[in-house]
Interface confidence: low
C-alpha cells in the first residue's frame, strides 16, 4: 500500500477578524494508526492548536467526526479569529508509539492571513491656539488593521491637503498595523467654521472609508480689530465714546477703559454678536464727563483677548473745543499690537 500522505489543499486562507477560519486537511490512508495534531509554525517553537487525542481547545472544532474508524478528514475550524492568529498552520500525522506517539508526516502548511479593520481615525490638533497665517500640525492615528496596505488622505473643508507625512508601523511584518500621519495646515481668518478631516481607506472597509475630524474652532485664535469713535453729545458736558471690537475668536475677552492712563472701567464680553464666519463683534461705550477735566483727555480702549497680551487703541478728546465740533475718531492712534504666537 502507498505510504500515507497528509494533504493540505489550501496554500493560504484569508479570513476577516471575528470570523471562523476553516483549515482543511486529509490523509490518504488509515495506516499507520495514530492521532492528528495541528500546529502553528514549524520547528521547536511551534504552537499546538489542536490535539485529536487529548486537551481542551475551546476555539477549535473538527469538520468531521474524528471518532469514526474510517475517517480521513482532519480539517478544523478556528472561531473568533483575531490578527494574532495569523501564521502558517500544519496538520501533522502521528504514529502510535510507546510511551509516546511519534511524528510521522506533516502537511505542506496553510498560511492564515487575517483581515482586520482599522480603528476609527482619531485626529488631534495642537495644544495651544494659533493665529491666522500660522501653520499648525494635526495628527491622525488608526490602529489594528491588517493587511498592511492602507491609504490615508487629509482634507480641509473638502479640499485635499498635500503637506503631510505618514508612517505605517511596524515597518516589518506584523499581525496588525498602525498608521500615524501628521498634516500641516495654514490657518486663515475664515477658519472658525473649518474642519480638518483624516480619511482612511482599507480593503476591509469595502470602499467605505473611515473618517476622523477636528474642528479648527478648537485651534484658531482670531485677534480682534479695534476702533474707537466719538458719538454725538448726549448732554452739554458729556461725550459718548465707543470701542468697537470686531472679528475675534474665541469669545473670551476683557476690555478696560483708561482715562489718561488710569483705569476707568473693566468689563467682560458677554452679549456678543456672531458674524457669518464664526467670529464675534462686541461694542463697549464710555460716557465721559468733559466738565470734570481741565486738560485734553486721552481715552484708551485696552483689550485682552484669550489670555494674550493686551492690544489697545486710543482717542484724544479735546476739552477746549466744544464737544459738538469734535470729529469722529479724532487723532485716533494705535498704541501697538503685541500679538504673540505661543503655538
Amino acid at each position: 500500500e502507498e505510504e500515507l500522505q497528509v494533504i493540505q489543499p489550501d496554500k493560504s486562507v484569508l479570513v476577516a477578524a471575528g470570523e471562523t477560519a476553516t483549515l482543511r486537511c486529509t490523509a490518504t490512508s488509515l495506516i499507520p494508526v495514530g492521532p492528528i495534531q495541528w500546529f502553528r509554525g514549524a520547528g521547536p517553537g511551534r504552537e499546538l492548536i489542536y490535539n485529536q487525542k487529548e486537551g481542551h481547545f475551546p476555539r477549535v472544532t473538527t469538520v468531521s467526526d474524528l471518532t469514526k474508524r474510517n475517517n480521513m478528514d482532519f480539517s478544523i475550524r478556528i472561531g473568533n479569529i483575531t490578527p494574532a492568529d495569523a501564521g502558517t498552520y500544519y496538520c501533522v500525522k502521528f504514529r502510535k508509539g510507546s510511551p509516546d506517539d511519534v511524528e510521522f508526516k506533516s502537511g505542506a502548511g496553510t498560511e492564515l492571513s487575517v483581515r482586520a479593520k482599522p480603528s476609527a481615525p482619531v485626529v488631534s490638533g495642537p495644544a495651544a491656539r494659533a493665529t491666522p497665517q500660522h501653520t499648525v500640525s494635526f495628527t491622525c492615528e488608526s490602529h489594528g488593521f491588517s493587511p498592511r496596505d492602507i491609504t490615508l488622505k487629509w482634507f480641509k473643508n473638502g479640499n485635499e491637503l498635500s503637506d503631510f507625512q505618514t508612517n505605517v508601523d511596524p515597518v516589518g511584518e506584523s499581525v496588525s498595523y498602525s498608521i500615524h500621519s501628521t498634516a500641516k495646515v495654514v490657518l486663515t481668518r475664515e477658519d472658525v467654521h473649518s474642519q480638518v478631516i483624516c480619511e482612511v481607506a482599507h480593503v476591509t472597509l469595502q470602499g467605505d472609508p473611515l473618517r476622523g475630524t477636528a474642528n479648527l474652532s478648537e485651534t484658531i485664535r482670531v485677534p480682534p480689530t479695534l476702533e474707537v469713535t466719538q458719538q454725538p453729545v448726549r448732554a452739554e458736558n458729556q461725550v459718548n465714546v465707543t470701542c468697537q471690537v470686531r472679528k475675534f475668536y474665541p469669545q473670551r475677552l476683557q476690555l478696560t477703559w483708561l482715562e489718561n492712563g488710569n483705569v476707568s472701567r473693566t468689563e467682560t464680553a458677554s452679549t456678543v454678536t456672531e458674524n457669518k464666519d464664526g467670529t464675534y463683534n462686541w461694542m463697549s461705550w464710555l460716557l465721559v464727563n468733559v466738565s470734570a477735566h481741565r486738560d485734553d483727555v486721552k481715552l484708551t480702549c485696552q483689550v485682552e483677548h484669550d489670555g494674550q497680551p493686551a492690544v489697545s487703541k486710543s482717542h484724544d478728546l479735546k476739552v477746549s473745543a466744544h464737544p459738538k465740533e469734535q470729529g469722529s475718531n479724532t487723532a485716533a492712534e494705535n498704541t501697538g499690537s503685541n500679538e504673540r504666537n505661543i503655538y
Epitope: 508612517n167 508601523d169 511596524p170 515597518v171 516589518g172 511584518e173 500615524h180
Partner: antibody
C-alpha cells in the same frame, strides 16, 4: 559568502552631488532591503533611507528628503545612493547595509565610502 | 519620530567584568530593537536583533533583554576584543533611529 562592496572615496565641492554604489553578492539580492547609514567623523550612526530590492519601494529619512535618491539595479545586484546639494557637514562615511524584512536589522555592512566636502 | 536614548555614553571596565548598557525608546517599540558593535575605522557589526536574539557567530557572552521602551545589552566577562562602541537601533518605525552610542574603554 555574503558581501557588500562599496565604491571608493570621493572629494566634492559644496553644492555638488555624489553617487555611492554598493555591489551585493552571495545572497538573493531581491530578498532583502538595502539601507544607507552615514557617520559624521566622531559622531554616531544616522539612517538615511532604504530601498526594498525586490519591489523597489523606497523610504527616506525626512532629514534627507529632497536631497537623497536611492536606487537599485537588480540585474547588477547593486544599490546606489546619491546625495545632492552637498555641504561641508555632509562630510562623512556612508555605509550600505543589508536589511531584514521583518525586524529591519542590518546584518551585513559595506566597509563604507568616505565622502569629503570641501571648497 | 521615535527617539532612542542610550546610557551611559561611556564606561571604563576591566577584562572579566560584567557590563550592562541600557537603551530607552520614546514610545513602545515591542521588541523591534537591535544592538551593534563598532570598532574604530570599521563598519558596525550586528550583535543582537529583535531585542534578545543573538546573531549567528556572536559569542554567547553577549545577551539582550527588554520589551516596550526599556532594553539592555549585557556583556558577561568582558574580553579584550569587546572594547568598542555599542549602538542600539529601533526598527519599529521610520525614520529608523540609533542611540547615541556607548564607548566601552579599558580601565
Amino acid at each position: 559568502q555574503v558581501q557588500l562592496v562599496q565604491s571608493g572615496a570621493e572629494v566634492k565641492k559644496p553644492g555638488a552631488s555624489v553617487k555611492v554604489s554598493c555591489k551585493a553578492s552571495g545572497y538573493t539580492f531581491t530578498s532583502n532591503a538595502m539601507h544607507w547609514v552615514r557617520q559624521v567623523p566622531g559622531q554616531g550612526l544616522e539612517w538615511m533611507g532604504w530601498i526594498k530590492a525586490g519591489n523597489g519601494e523606497i523610504k527616506y529619512s525626512q532629514k534627507f528628503q529632497g536631497r537623497v535618491t536611492i536606487t537599485r539595479d537588480t540585474s547588477a545586484t547593486t544599490a546606489y545612493m546619491e546625495l545632492s546639494s552637498l555641504r561641508s557637514e555632509d562630510t562623512a562615511v556612508y555605509y550600505c547595509a543589508r536589511g531584514d524584512y521583518y525586524y529591519y536589522y542590518m546584518d551585513v555592512w559595506g566597509k563604507g565610502t568616505t565622502v569629503t566636502v570641501s571648497s | 519620530d521615535i527617539q532612542v536614548t542610550q546610557s551611559p555614553s561611556s564606561l571604563s571596565a576591566s577584562v572579566g567584568d560584567r557590563v550592562t548598557i541600557t537603551c530607552r525608546a520614546s514610545q513602545s517599540i515591542s521588541d523591534f530593537l537591535n544592538w551593534y558593535q563598532q570598532k574604530p575605522g570599521k563598519a558596525p557589526k550586528l550583535l543582537i536583533h529583535a531585542a534578545s536574539s543573538l546573531q549567528n557567530g556572536v559569542p554567547s557572552r553577549f545577551s539582550g533583554s527588554g520589551s516596550g521602551t526599556d532594553f539592555s545589552l549585557t556583556i558577561n566577562s568582558l574580553q579584550p576584543e569587546d572594547f568598542a562602541t555599542y549602538y542600539c537601533q529601533q526598527s519599529y518605525s521610520t525614520p529608523l533611529s540609533f542611540g547615541g552610542g556607548t564607548k566601552v574603554e579599558i580601565k
